[in-house]
Amino acid sequence: SAHLHPRDSCPLGPGRCCHLETVQATLEDLGWSDWVLSPRQLQLSMCVGECPHLYRSANTHALIKARLHGLQPDRVPAPCCVPSSYTPVVLMHRTDSGVSLQTYDDLVAQGCHCA
Amino acid sequence: SAHLHPRDSCPLGPGRCCHLETVQATLEDLGWSDWVLSPRQLQLSMCVGECPHLYRSANTHALIKARLHGLQPDRVPAPCCVPSSYTPVVLMHRTDSGVSLQTYDDLVAQGCHCA
């Protein structure tokens, strides 16, 4: 909407608002050690941080949600930080016949916004 | 992923988990009274509720996020309830020449999931 403007500067201080962060995880963490061969250690980007009023609003719905959360905080939740896009990654799988490569399009976040 | 299964039954009790809810709002609430016409309150559907482990997971990323949140709750946030789809709605706008209709594709949520 032309009448509510999302903003990109974080009013809470550096690193506090919704952003992409790299998290290390092992195959054991994910419960994947029996069916994924590699990589043994995964670098996963995830969306973390808060979504203060109008920060990185995903769309009109998120702008409205932010506004109504300010008015009815018990009824309407604040927008939250979720992936806006993903980057494809390849995992090496064990299969009955040996090993295969499989691409996952929705495993690692590439960008974040407040929805 | 075939190895983490999203689930659809809420372990927290009825109405507690991520779902669609109708919220009433006035034009004044939204700051729209100068440019939108409406004889009555607006009805908006929004996604509210919690996202317990594997509930309505949006995709592989959300399944992983849920798992890592269990292991590193301070580092990785739990998935949160956001729109999975939107329903197009029409707003009546005031214009210099009178009134016109405009369709918004991203204003009202139609379905919800945990991302």
Epitope: - | P39, L42, Q43, S45, Q110
Partner: antibody
């Protein structure tokens, strides 16, 4: 493409009720507003009320308030209109009509119509 | 309640322009839609929001709206345009209101 298929013609006694159904196919049922519009023989169109499945709320024209009930069953993509305390003046063709959700107005811009259901009220 | 007034009938020769009016208090500040209904058939939306046509509606249908009158114009009227036409808007509480309808007769 979108189709609205209504239930068949009805003959009713004065004082009784009638329930007409409208089954939608094509498009997302919950994402639209469904209205009921009637047309007495040789007369014009008259809006009775409507429902928006996603909000679960119905609105009625003042004239029919208290006598008409409009409901929707999302699982079958079907809308219903029940009119009670029927009188001879209720003899008409009843149409269901679908349109976009118009925020604050809810109904109008009827871009798809059912084939109509003739309800005859006679003793 | 808000009232829309239409002439009961309008006649036009084939190929000529037909104008069907819809009068209402300050209707120029309302959104108006027009529906066509042929005998024994369901209505069809032909014009909405001043002069927008749904897909499949010929370009010869257009609309205008100012002051107290909205007008549906059919240029180069054809025999197939013979039908009843209804205007529609909303009252002050947001209820749908239809005009009484106009029967368009294409002469000849």
């Amino acid at each position: 493409q979108v189709q609205l298929v209504q239930s068949g013609a009805e003959v009713k006694k004065p004082g009784s009720s009638v329930k007409v159904s409208c089954k939608a196919s094509g498009g997302t049922f919950r994402s639209y507003a469904v209205s009921w519009v009637r047309q007495a023989p040789g007369q014009g169109l008259e809006w009775m009320g409507g429902i928006i499945p996603i909000f679960g709320t119905a609105n009625y024209a003042q004239k029919f308030q208290g006598r008409v009930t409009i409901t929707a069953d999302e699982s079958t993509s079907t809308a219903y209109m029940e009119l009670s305390s029927l009188r001879s003046e209720d003899t008409a063709v009843y149409y269901c009509a679908r349109g976009p959700i118009i925020m604050g107005y809810q109904f109008g811009l009827f871009d798809h119509w059912g084939q109509g259901t003739l309800v005859t009220v006679s003793s | 309640s808000y009232e829309l007034t239409q002439p009961p009938s309008v006649s036009v020769s084939p190929g000529q322009t037909a104008s069907i009016t819809c009068s209402g208090d300050n209707i120029g500040s309302h959104i108006v839609s027009w529906y066509q209904q042929k005998p024994g058939q369901s209505p069809v939306l032909v014009i909405y929001d001043k002069s927008n046509r749904p897909s499949g509606i010929p370009e010869r249908f257009s609309g205008s709206n100012s002051g107290n009158t909205a007008t549906l114009t059919i240029s180069g009227t054809q025999a197939m345009d013979e039908a009843d036409y209804y205007c529609q808007t909303w009252d002050s509480i947001g209820s749908v209101v239809f005009g009484g309808g106009t029967k368009l007769t294409v002469l000849g």
